[in-house]
Interface confidence: medium
């Protein structure tokens, strides 16, 4: 790696490109410094002066190295069915995720736009597929020999108890009732619960600043434009 850094702005010669954390300014026709996350370009570079950066104002952010004239607005506050898993800072947007017992019915780039309560399976029905962060519960009718007597988003169909002498046969929504002789069970007694979906979304971290494509090797001047959008420009 270079032991020193060339000062910006500078003109890229044909066949070479601006380096990491620099952008090509079409007006100045120079490689100029990008602003760091949490900042934006207050004054664009010229042939003789580099980009002047300034901190983002409250409730605004930039997450990437950028040259946008204004920081992006943080999203609105989380609704009552959501929890704030990442606060709005100068370097990151607010992230809202659904609280326990809810799932994301309409997602956005990060977090959730619209949460909905997890479906509850009524008696006679059990959970076939548990709810996740982004999908609802799927219920299924309890098969013969099994039942569910709860209204629940986590309970599955359980086997009827096996009686030596049956007092009342079980059905899809009720367990069998045995006479006073002690019953046996094919499974341990008590409701079988599926775990609630737990938010596993980790906090977004800044990607490693490496070029993802081989640099341009065109000899043409000026160099091709890069869209000056903070969200679309990496390090």
């Amino acid at each position: 790696l270079p032991a020193q850094v060339a000062f910006t702005p500078y003109a890229p010669e044909p066949g070479s490109t601006c380096r990491l954390r620099e952008y090509y300014d079409q007006t100045a026709q120079m490689c100029c410094s990008k602003c760091s996350p949490g900042q934006h370009a207050k004054v664009f570079c010229t042939k003789t002066s580099d980009t002047v950066c300034d901190s983002c104002e409250d409730s605004t952010y930039t997450q990437l190295w950028n040259w946008v004239p204004e920081c992006l607005s943080c999203g609105s506050r989380c609704s009552s069915d959501q929890v704030e898993t990442q606060a709005c800072t100068r370097e990151q947007n607010r992230i809202c995720t659904c609280r326990p017992g809810w799932y994301c019915a309409l997602s956005k780039q990060e977090g959730c736009r619209l949460c909905a309560p997890l479906r509850k399976c009524r008696p006679g029905f059990g959970v076939a597929r548990p709810g996740t962060e982004t999908s609802d519960v799927v219920c299924k009718p309890c098969a013969p020999g099994t039942f569910s007597n709860t209204t629940s988003s986590t309970d599955i169909c359980r086997p009827h108890q096996i009686c030596n002498v049956v007092a009342i046969p079980g059905n899809a929504s009720m367990d069998a009732v045995c006479t006073s002789t002690s019953p046996t069970r094919s499974m341990a007694p008590g409701a079988v619960h599926l775990p609630q979906p737990v938010s596993t979304r980790s906090q977004h971290t800044q990607p490693t600043p490496e070029p993802s494509t081989a640099p341009s090797t065109s000899f043409l001047l000026p160099m091709g434009p890069s869209p000056p959008a903070e969200g679309s420009t990496g390090d």
Partner: antibody, heavy 119, light 111 residues
């Protein structure tokens, strides 16, 4: 490691032709612009010609324009310099060099091949 | 006559500091194009010493440093050593010539 190996130099009469080759290895050849630089005996360095990574764009010094043609075969990782209508003043050691992707400059050079134009 | 102007020779005693200047124009150094410096030891190919005005490639000792101001640039060598005796060339891109240009070269003699 990066290696550039020139070949094709030799003695040629004025008005004659010669084709120099530069075999490259140790790097992604298509990702780099390449160039030819020459040095007359006892003199300084003179840039001759350059070509973009894909081969679409070529540049020439005024002193060789219309006589020399630079090209590359990316499938063979080889750079070429076709030299026609050679003159005595073209006598020099010809170096092929790789252009640095960022900021510029020629970061790797071959050992050179001597071209002598004489009757 | 070279587009970039360098002194033909400079000299210094071991341990001393020497500088080599490189003067261009508004179409090369003054236009903002990077200045690159090469060292050529006798009988060998040139070696990149400084690129983009001030960058030292890995392996180049920090005794070598580059500077640029306006239409000129310079190479400074501190703690001069016998093995520094070589020819030094500056180089830049020239927009009016649409090509790369070199200085005439400077011969450094270590006394």
């Amino acid at each position: 490691q990066v290696q550039l190996l020139e070949s094709g130099g030799g003695l040629v009469q004025p008005g004659g032709s010669l084709r120099l080759s530069c075999a490259a290895s140790g790097f992604s050849f298509t990702s780099y612009a390449m160039t030819w630089v020459r040095q007359a005996p006892g003199k300084g360095l003179e840039w001759v010609s350059g070509i973009s990574g894909g081969g679409a764009a070529t540049f020439y010094a005024d002193s060789v324009k219309g006589r020399f043609t630079i090209s590359r075969d990316n499938s063979k990782n080889t750079l070429y310099l076709q030299m026609n209508s050679l003159r005595a003043e073209d006598t020099a050691v010809y170096y092929c060099a790789r252009q640095s992707q960022y900021v510029g400059g020629f970061d790797y050079w071959g050992q050179g091949t001597l071209v002598t134009v004489s009757s | 006559q070279s587009v970039l102007t360098q002194p033909p020779s400079v000299s210094g005693a071991p341990g001393q500091r020497v500088t080599i200047s490189c003067t261009g124009s508004s179409s090369n150094i003054g236009a903002g194009y990077g200045v690159h410096w090469y060292q050529q030891l006798p009988g060998t190919a040139p070696k990149l010493l400084i690129h983009g005005n001030t960058n030292r490639p890995s392996g180049v000792p920090d005794r070598f440093s580059g500077f640029k101001s306006g239409t000129s640039a310079s190479l400074a060598i501190t703690g001069l050593q016998a093995e520094d005796e070589a020819d030094y060339y500056c180089q830049s891109y020239d927009s009016s010539l649409s090509g790369w240009v070199f200085g005439g070269g400077t011969k450094l003699t270590v006394l």
